[in-house]
């Protein structure tokens, strides 16, 4: 028996508007009905929780109102979007998946998605 496998892309480049999306897919060993997904950021030897949501299989993912994350779920796949990113937010974003109910509990952690964020250059003043 090993840890539950979680797959996510190795690299994602955020859009010029500071939005990054990636898929987090997990290999469920059982028939979970309640799943918790947490996005963690590791950078400069610090780990912070970016956002988290618990959802019932077949239902919509619900993050807190002030969360920078949104997402949808389909089967064992979660489509995550993080917004409001700036260059200083560049780092390794890790998908943590916990199968909460029914027992037994399982934990899986992805290998991380390196998200690169480049702040857009300010538009030069036009001489018209």
């Amino acid at each position: 028996c090993k840890a539950m496998h979680v797959a996510q892309p190795a690299v994602v480049l955020a859009s010029s508007r500071g939005i990054a999306s990636f898929v987090c897919e997990y290999a469920s060993p059982g028939k979970a009905t309640e799943v918790r997904v947490t996005v963690l950021r590791q950078a400069d030897s610090q780990v912070t929780e970016v956002c988290a949501a618990t959802y019932m299989m077949g239902n919509e993912l619900t993050f807190l109102d002030d969360s920078i994350c949104t997402g949808t779920s389909s089967g064992n796949q979660v489509n995550l979007t993080i917004q409001g990113l700036r260059a200083m937010d560049t780092g390794l974003y890790i998908c943590k998946v916990e199968l909460m109910y029914p027992p037994p509990y399982y934990l899986g952690i992805g290998n991380g998605t390196q998200i690169y964020v480049i702040d857009p250059e300010p538009c030069p003043d036009s001489d018209f």
């Epitope: 028996c1 090993k2 840890a3 539950m4 947490t38 963690l40 590791q42 030897s45 610090q46 780990v47 912070t48 929780e49 390794l92 890790i94 943590k96 916990e98 037994p104 509990y105 934990l107 899986g108 952690i109 290998n111 991380g112």
Partner: nanobody, 127 residues
């Protein structure tokens, strides 16, 4: 799936020693980092120490006093606590995290990466 059960807590005088044990069932410990954490009343849960196949890490507050070890053949992890102080009084938890290539000495003990938490065992250091 992994199931963890810890034991070994109790009451000890300042300067004394205790050994906590964390027994795993349902899986080999090999692919996991095992961590010890503690929570004092009114405080956040904090990292004490953790161990994977080749590395150990300790919180600064316990370095030189606590020693973590693992016996994969018995599926056990131990926390030897020496020179105990009143400030070590807390509920101690054992937890597991899948070992990942991006873990560093500084991050592999981070509580955010852990699951399979035990119920906790009380350690009280008092004269």
């Amino acid at each position: 799936e992994v199931q963890l059960v810890e034991s070994g807590g109790g009451l000890v005088q300042p300067g004394g020693s205790l050994r906590l044990s964390c027994a795993a069932s349902g899986s080999t410990l090999d692919p996991f980092v095992i961590g010890w954490f503690r929570q004092a009343p009114g405080k956040e849960r904090e990292t004490v120490s953790c161990i994977n196949r080749s590395r150990t890490s300790y919180a600064d507050s316990v370095k030189g006093r606590f020693t973590i070890s693992r016996d994969n053949s018995k599926n056990m992890v131990y926390l030897q606590m020496n020179s105990l102080r009143a400030e070590d009084t807390a509920v101690y938890y054992c937890a597991a995290s899948p070992d990942k290539p991006f873990y560093t000495d500084q991050t592999m003990c981070n509580k955010h990466y852990y699951g399979y938490w035990t119920q906790g065992t009380q350690v009280t250091v008092s004269s």
